[in-house]
Amino acid sequence: LQDLCSNCPAGTFCDNNRSQICSPCPPNSFSSAGGQRTCDICRQCKGVFKTRKECSSTSNAECDCISGYHCLGAECSMCEQDCKQGQELTKKGCKDCCFGTFNDQKRGICRPWTNCSLDGKSVLVNGTKERDVVCGPSPADLSPGASSATPPAPAREPGHSPQ
């Protein structure tokens, strides 16, 4: 005996009470695949969630977090409190980044400033809690008369002072 349920498209369910007739999903429910014997209840975006995409007969609602929070987890299963730039979220709430670290986002952790000297460069702009340092040319490149477009000058003779 052929299973008539396999013919039921997404957005319907196979109603065993009605000789396996394909019935549309009731309001606030959906079936995203064919051949379903029940429709799933639509997710409701309430409380800390807000609706990003309404539920339809073939797809579940999608939620976002309300202002002041951001999504965590698959399908925005949780909302995490935002912090200000220059802060990170700890077990005790939002805390300022320690000296030498920064966070330029409302989420995530404070990260160490770039160590310009590791790349042989100098600090052009100091870092803050909100911004990383900006590295500039190497200290050698900043010596008088030096230009990144010209090859390095030959070694000076003893007693010869730079112009």
Partner: nanobody, 116 residues
Framework: QVQLVESGGGLVQPGGSLRLSCVAS????????MGWGRQVPGKEFEWVSG???????DYADSVKGRFTISRDNAKNTVYLEMNSLKSEDTAEYYC??????????WGQGTQVTVSS
């Protein structure tokens, strides 16, 4: 499928008491931190209270000493006992899955109105 069903809200006079309940299903309740939050339309969502899987409780300063959270793992239920209610406690109350800083609201909420 995760489901939270809140109940116990209502109209109460200032100084009165209410007990909210939240029945959970669709996940392993006993291993998860649960809590309560509230929202007044047009205002920020406010975390109210939480209880860890070990039974450690935590409260927002605004409700400390007046509200008591508890859980019954056998019944998959978390409770919020609210005493000495004030008009500023008027809000839609939601059961939460998760801790103080990150959580999900999966229920319809229950309205609490404190008014004389």
């Amino acid at each position: 499928q995760v489901q939270l069903v809140e109940s116990g809200g209502g109209l109460v006079q200032p100084g009165g008491s209410l007990r909210l309940s939240c029945v959970a299903s669709g996940f392993v309740f006993s291993t998860v931190t649960m809590g309560w939050g509230r929202q007044v339309p047009g205002k920020e969502f406010e975390w109210v209270s939480g209880v860890s899987s070990e039974g450690i409780t935590d409260y927002a300063d605004s409700v400390k000493g007046r509200f008591t959270i508890s859980r019954d793992n056998a019944k998959n239920t978390v409770y919020l006992e609210m005493n000495s209610l004030k008009s500023e406690d008027t809000a839609e109350y939601y059961c939460l899955i998760g801790g103080r800083w990150s959580f999900g609201t999966w229920g319809q909420g229950t309205q609490v109105t404190v008014s004389s």
